[in-house]
């Protein structure tokens, strides 16, 4: 669709005569008829296939034609066409004398014709005017012409319709050739695809407007390049969505079981050495001078009662010193100046001579000890209870009160709640400090794996086209991560390229 424009500029008829040579009375009141048609090697009469237009009377005899409306006519003259411009044309311009006001062809005598020119040739679409001048024996006509496209039509022959738009069916303006020129932030054949935030992950992110990055299920972060770990994952990471790969020192389905209590909590005090002995359990090896489960208690060197035979112990900066009772000497008052004749054995102890009477030894009754049986037995002195157990004297014997999770005479045994195989359906049992935990196989859940649930959603390989399947364990559903070029909940559809412009 376009317009052939003809601009009449000047008509010269100095003698004021008709084509027949007869003069006009009183002068030649001149108007024009224009016929535009298809190219003819020899321009002949016949239908004006591209259109016709007439002017009102523009002047008398010789005159210049103004560029705007003149006496109700338009200059340039417009000859619109609704077809592809062929690039060639034929043009007939007739100048007529109007004796009266009726300019219809049937109202004029045939000899009212002043002049007739006919041209033909090639004409490309464009803004530039072609200037021409046609001269006959009596008249001269100067004019120019061009072909331009109608609004919204583009291209070499005005055949491409293009309307700028900025809505969800396209964000573009039109180039001179009719091709689309996308507005900033948009791409695609119809400029309907937003350009996402720079760096937005090609598969895991998308956008609905420019410079945006929205994440597909299982992904997060400004550029949607960080996977979302399994819901409840505490001390773990992922490389694909819904994973929970435990950090060092952590275990369990949600990486919430502490396998390295020593490093994470540093429970041992006063420079003690910490050893992991299971989930949330540990043992502290104390430096000399310290005691307690966490080596938190400072140990007096006299606490071990090193002085024998009733000697009293005094703490000193560099150790201890024993004050011996009469009849005894030595670092620990271990040497006696007494013999059995001095009845040195207390609490019913019996005396035995040694070294030909130079020394003696007391054999103590139950519940008494010491070289003179002077001490009541404290069976807890040696701290016999392991794993933080509390030692209790019970008359002639002792007993250990164990911390939760330990048993045995000396609390040396770790209680295994798993020994009775409490996890059903092949579940894996994990001992905890205060009980146990079952890790269930696919298809089972519950504290003891006793509840049958759906199987692994990915087991049936629901994703097509080499897509990666992720099981969302919290919802027993799957998510397909499509490779480039495929879409759909199962990645079953290739991304089809739209057909070319329907111009």
């Amino acid at each position: 669709s376009g317009v052939f424009q003809l601009q009449l500029q000047e008509f010269i008829n100095e003698r004021g005569v008709l084509a027949s040579g007869r003069p006009c009375e009183p002068g030649c009141r001149t108007f024009f008829r224009v016929c535009l048609k298809h190219f003819q090697a020899v321009v002949s009469p016949g239908p004006c296939t591209f259109g016709t237009v007439s002017t009102p009377v523009l002047g008398t005899n010789s005159f210049a034609v103004r560029d705007d409306s003149s006496g109700g006519g338009r200059n340039p003259l417009q000859l619109p066409f609704n077809f592809t411009w062929p690039g060639t044309f034929s043009l007939i311009i007739e100048a007529w004398h109007a004796p009266g006001d009726d300019l219809r062809p049937e109202a004029l005598p045939p000899d009212a014709l002043i002049s007739k020119i006919a041209i033909q040739g090639s004409l490309a679409v464009g803004q530039n005017w072609l200037l021409d001048e046609q001269t006959s024996t009596l008249t001269r006509l100067r004019y120019s012409y061009r072909v331009i496209c109608s609004d919204n039509y583009y291209g070499d022959n005005c055949s491409r319709l293009c309307k700028k738009r900025n809505d969800h069916f396209g964000h573009y303006v039109c180039q001179p050739d009719g091709n689309l020129s996308c507005l900033p932030g948009w791409t695609g054949e119809y400029c309907q695809q937003p350009i996402c935030l720079s760096g937005c992950h090609e598969q895991n992110g998308y956008c609905s407007k420019p410079a945006e990055c929205l994440c597909r299920p299982g992904w997060q972060g400004r550029l949607c390049n960080e996977c979302i770990p399994h819901n409840g994952c505490r001390h773990g990471t992922c490389s694909t969505p819904w994973q929970c790969t435990c950090d060092e020192g952590w275990g369990g389905l949600f990486c919430d079981q502490d396998l390295n209590y020593c490093t994470h909590h540093s429970p041992c005090k006063n420079g003690a050495t910490c050893s992991n002995s299971g989930q949330r359990s540990y043992t502290c090896t104390c430096r000399p001078g310290y005691t307690g489960v966490d080596c938190e208690l400072e140990l007096s060197e006299c606490d071990s009662n090193p002085c024998r035979n009733g000697g009293s112990c005094k703490d000193q900066e560099d150790g201890y010193h024993c004050l011996c009772p009469p009849g005894y000497y030595g670092l620990h008052c271990e040497h006696s100046t007494l013999s059995c004749a001095d009845s040195p054995c207390f609490n019913g102890g019996s005396c035995r001579e040694r070294n030909q009477g130079a020394n003696y030894a007391c054999e103590c009754p139950p519940n008494f000890t010491g070289s003179n049986c002077e001490k009541k037995v404290d069976r807890c002195t040696s701290n016999p209870c392991a794993n933080g157990g509390q030692c209790l004297n019970r008359g002639p014997s002792r007993m250990c009160r164990c911390r939760p999770g330990f048993t045995g005479t000396y609390c040396e045994l770790h209680v295994s709640d798993c020994a009775r195989n409490p996890c059903a359906h092949g579940g894996t049992c994990h001992d905890l400090e205060n009980g146990l935990m079952c890790t269930c196989p696919a298809g089972f859940s519950g504290r003891r794996c006793e509840v049958r649930t759906s199987i692994d959603a990915c087991a049936s390989s629901p994703c097509f086209n080499r897509a990666t399947c992720y099981t969302d364990l919290s919802t027993d559903t799957f998510v397909c991560n499509c490779p480039y070029g495929f879409v759909g909940s199962r990645c079953e559809f290739p991304v089809g390229l739209p057909p070319s412009f329907p111009w």
Epitope: L161, K163, V487, F493, G496
Partner: antibody, heavy 121, light 104 residues
Framework: EVQLQESGPGLVKPSETLSLTCTVS??????????WGWIRQPPGKGLEWIGD???????YYNPSLKSRVTISVDTSKNQFSLKLSSVTAADTAVYYC?????????????WGQGTLVTVSS | SYELTQPPSVSVSPGQTASITCSGE??????VSWYQQKPGQSPVLVIY???ERPSGIPERFSGSNSGDTATLTISGTQAMDEADYYC?????????FGSGTKVT
């Protein structure tokens, strides 16, 4: 060839919410070349565009209905849905779902057969 | 809000040409679609982007659009063309339908 099918209750009480679903078969809803729209036609009257949605979830609504309309998409089920709240008798109409083609300048090249929704107590 | 105006009805004899107009401010700068709707049926797209025909639509349907008026022309009208016809355009992000024209 793509086909669209509307489903939902045919009778809704005044002040309640009208809910319809359009199921797309014979083609994927996951395409940037289409928008998925809802159009309604009161008995004996003309067509009124309600709104549309892309597969990514971008929505566009008729300004006169915007405060009451919600359109959503479920790509895994190849469905999109319409919710119209606080309905009155004036919302009684045949509701159509349609595919609007970017390559057709937004023209609706495929329509459902329509479902009549009556608002009455 | 943007409005598209159509004549309520157009009568035409079989074999003659029917012209249906659709007017709206600056409509020539928008793409216009035309839909045919027969009683009890869903609308069918007959013209898109002013003058393009979808596959399966007869050549007797043509369209044009300039200025403030778009026109759907049915040349050599047949009895089966009796229906309601709606024009449609996009204003900003919203779809707008014309009031509809009954062709008998």
């Amino acid at each position: 060839e793509v086909q669209l099918q509307e489903s939902g209750p045919g009778l809704v009480k005044p002040s309640e919410t009208l809910s319809l679903t359009c199921t797309v078969s014979g083609g994927s809803i996951n395409s940037g070349n289409y928008y998925w729209g809802w159009i309604r036609q009161p008995p004996g009257k003309g067509l009124e565009w309600i709104g549309d949605i892309s597969y990514t979830g971008s929505t566009y609504y008729n300004p006169s209905l915007k405060s009451r309309v919600t359109i959503s998409v479920d790509t895994s089920k190849n469905q999109f849905s319409l919710k119209l709240s606080s309905v009155t008798a004036a919302d009684t109409a045949v509701y159509y779902c349609a595919r609007e083609d970017v390559m057709y300048g937004g023209g609706g090249d495929s329509w459902g057969q329509g479902t009549l929704v009556t608002v009455s107590s | 809000s943007y409005e598209l105006t159509q004549p309520p009805s157009v009568s035409v004899s079989p074999g003659q040409t029917a012209s249906i107009t659709c007017s709206g401010e600056g409509l020539g700068d928008k793409y216009v679609s035309w839909y045919q709707q027969k009683p009890g049926q869903s609308p069918v797209l007959v013209i898109y982007e002013d003058s393009e025909r979808p596959s399966g639509i007869p050549e007797r349907f043509s369209g044009s659009n300039s200025g403030d008026t778009a026109t759907l022309t049915i040349s050599g009208t047949q009895a089966m063309d009796e229906a309601d016809y709606y024009c449609q355009a996009w204003d900003s992000e919203a779809g707008v339908f014309g009031s509809g024209t009954k062709v008998t």
